[in-house]
């Protein structure tokens, strides 16, 4: 009796695993193996693919065959007993084209009411993405536990911080990687959960503002409680892409280890330029608060884009606010050619109600104020160009008294 | 697979010195932080300290600060712990243990250790 | 430094039964809680990391809870080769601090 040729071959390819699958074409013919030969384009020649060889299941592995990724080849498979089937072929492909990306591997660090995630390629120093590694993106979706209700959260790196959850709560995700410049999506990665901790007594440093003073940044931050000491780190931002990078890691910054101010001041050439991401811990003595939220800071930025300085006219209802550069040290004023928007925020002085204005001008009425009251005034300074989407910190509040009744003319 | 192999057991007389050694393979060497930890005979665990073979930052145990060094060569992927006043009591089992990768926020457990080496300090 | 107190220090039970160690922190640690396995002449083996998360190998019979300052390893069906000595620890804040051990005998 004649054999068959198998039918159906799949071509499955995740990462840099090489997995062939077909159908048996009689299966009532028992001990039959199976063999697979392949070609390169441009060869006429066929070789019997190595693991492919005199098979009994219906699937075998040819990772180990160090084939050229972009390049097409060919299959082909017989079924063997006594003699052999006739070759079936199997539509030519190309590696790269036809892979998909596997599950990426993924570590997961809690906080009380944050998860950090870690990110990496499910194969590592794949041979298959070896010029596509550092364009890797990764997508994931997060659930509580409890609830199942999905969040998804597109475009993000190989490190990644989830915010504002509960403390003691079980989250659940699953994570997949893309090459947005191949089109490939790849496939989840197992679900992964962890449960947040308790609430840390010590919350984490907020509204971390850097701010340059002389040759000298200034980086302050809020906290609740006083008697506390505080260590700043700060990490390459484009790093963020990489950890497998080697330099992958929070450094220190010197003037800012154990300080026990919510400001700290180190010179400029600490930064050489670039952007970085800086955070902030507090500590006690016994216990560690968590990181703060990471602040980007682009030195190139910073360097320029200063406070604005303003002048008051004081009204009976009203201010005259009088923008002009920010001045340097040595009390030069610094010269800036490109378009500022101001956001000007004023409050009762004996309130907390604070409002505000946007203005593109220089010269700004603050309008419908009491006669005879103190109000204070601090501006900061925004970029409108939308790639250079940067602010100033604020300038240090000032505070005038409106004139009697009468004398808004 | 991850593997850290230890230098051999030493005998040393007090006030000398000692210098361990761990080889570490089946993974990037630079990406994970080296530990040091000591078990005296019949006794518990104790943290000596821990270094980052990628820039060599070390951290330490107090008790141990000023009588420990800890080296890297990356060359041989292989740590170093040097212990120097011995004195009778800092006779134990040294190990090594790899800690959690240097790209965490946060530290990590002791996933691996090395199989020890025996310390003996005596007159 | 942070001390960790783990109860009992010896523990007698037999195949089969179900057996329960704790481990207090004198602060909070957040979960930073590993617990090893260490028999005689051998270095110790990760069993349990972020007191919960049972590490690849490790026999489903081991489970770890707890958080805080309270942290519990279960077996919840002893194994003649469970009999071994068993070590928690933190790694929240440096040093990085044992407890004393609990040993874990036949019956």
């Known amino acids: 009796k004649n054999l068959k040729s198998p039918q159906k071959v799949e071509v499955d390819i995740i990462d840099d695993n090489f997995i062939l699958r077909w159908n048996r074409s009689d299966e009532s013919v028992g001990n039959v193996t199976f063999s697979f030969d392949y070609q390169k384009t441009g060869m006429d020649n066929w070789i019997k693919l190595s693991g492919c060889q005199n098979i009994t299941s219906t699937k075998c592995n040819f990772s180990s065959l160090k084939l050229n990724v972009y390049e097409e080849i060919k299959l082909r498979i017989r079924a063997e007993k006594e003699n052999t089937s006739s070759w079936y072929e199997v539509d030519s492909f190309t590696p790269f084209r036809k892979a998909q990306i596997g599950p990426p591997e993924v570590h997961l660090e809690a906080e009380d009411k944050a998860i950090v995630i870690h990110i990496s390629p499910g194969t590592k120093d794949s041979v298959m993405w070896a010029l596509d590694g550092l364009s890797f993106t990764y997508s994931l979706v997060i659930w509580k536990n409890s609830s199942g209700v999905e969040e998804r959260i597109e475009n993000i790196y190989s490190r990644h911080k989830i915010y504002k959850l509960s403390p003691e709560t079980t989250y659940c995700l699953k994570v997949k990687a893309a090459l947005l410049t191949s089109w490939k999506i790849g496939v989840y990665s197992p679900v992964h959960c962890i449960k947040t901790t308790v609430e840390n007594e010590l919350p984490p440093p907020e509204n971390i503002e850097v701010s340059v003073q002389n040759q000298n940044y200034v980086l302050k931050w809020d906290y609740t409680y006083a008697n506390m000491t505080f260590q700043v780190q700060w990490l390459h931002a484009f790093l963020k892409r990489n950890p497998g990078n080697h330099l992958y890691k929070w450094k220190q910054i010197p003037d800012c280890e154990n300080v026990k101010t919510t400001q700290c001041v180190f010179p400029q050439n600490v930064f050489q330029k670039g952007i970085y991401l800086l955070r902030v811990q507090a500590s006690d003595g016994n216990n560690t608060s968590f990181w703060s939220e990471e602040i980007k800071f682009d030195t190139e930025i910073q360097a320029f884009l200063l406070p604005p300085v303003f002048n008051i006219r004081s009204l009976s209802d009203s201010f005259h606010i009088y923008i002009g550069a920010p001045k340097q040290s040595g009390n030069t004023p610094v010269i800036q050619d490109y378009p500022l928007i101001y956001e000007i925020i004023f409050w009762e002085n004996t309130s907390n109600a604070e409002r505000k204005i946007i203005e593109k001008k220089t010269d700004v009425t603050v309008p419908n104020l009491k006669p005879l009251t103190v109000y204070c005034v601090k501006a900061r300074a925004h970029t409108m160009d939308e790639k250079l989407n940067k602010s100033s910190v604020f300038s240090d509040a000032v505070c005038e008294k409106t004139k009697p009744g009468n004398t808004s003319k | 697979q991850v593997q850290l192999v230890q230098s051999g057991a030493e005998v040393k007389k007090p006030g000398a010195s000692v210098k361990v050694s761990c080889k570490a393979s089946?993974?990037?060497?630079?990406?994970?932080?080296m530990n040091w930890v000591r078990q005296a005979p019949g006794q518990g665990l104790e943290w000596i300290g821990k270094i980052d073979p990628s820039d060599s930052e070390t951290h330490f145990n107090q008790k141990f600060r000023d009588r420990v060094t800890l080296t890297v060569d990356k060359s041989t992927s292989t740590v170093y712990m040097e212990l120097s006043s011995l004195r009778s009591e800092d006779t134990a089992v040294y190990y090594c243990?790899?800690?959690?990768?240097?790209?965490?926020?946060?530290?990590?457990?002791?996933?691996?250790w090395g199989q020890g080496t025996l310390v003996t300090v005596s007159s | 430094d942070i001390q960790m107190t783990q109860s009992p220090s010896s523990l007698s039970a037999s195949v089969g039964d179900r057996v329960t160690i704790t481990c207090k922190s004198s602060e909070v640690i957040y979960n930073r809680l590993a617990w090893y396995q260490q028999k005689p002449g051998k270095a110790p083996k990760l069993l349990i990391s972020g007191a919960t998360t049972l590490e690849s190998g490790v026999p489903s019979r081991f489970s770890g809870s707890g958080s805080g300052k309270d942290y519990t390893l279960t077996i919840s069906s002893l194994q003649p080769e469970d009999f071994a000595t068993y070590y928690c620890?933190?790694?929240?804040?440096?040093?990085?601090?044992f407890g004393q051990g609990t040993k874990l005998e036949i019956k």
């Open positions: 243990a790899r800690g959690g990768r240097i790209s965490f926020d946060y530290d990590a457990a002791l996933d691996y």
């Open positions: 089946g993974y990037t060497f630079t990406s994970y932080w």
């Open positions: 620890q933190q790694y929240w804040n440096k040093p990085f601090t």
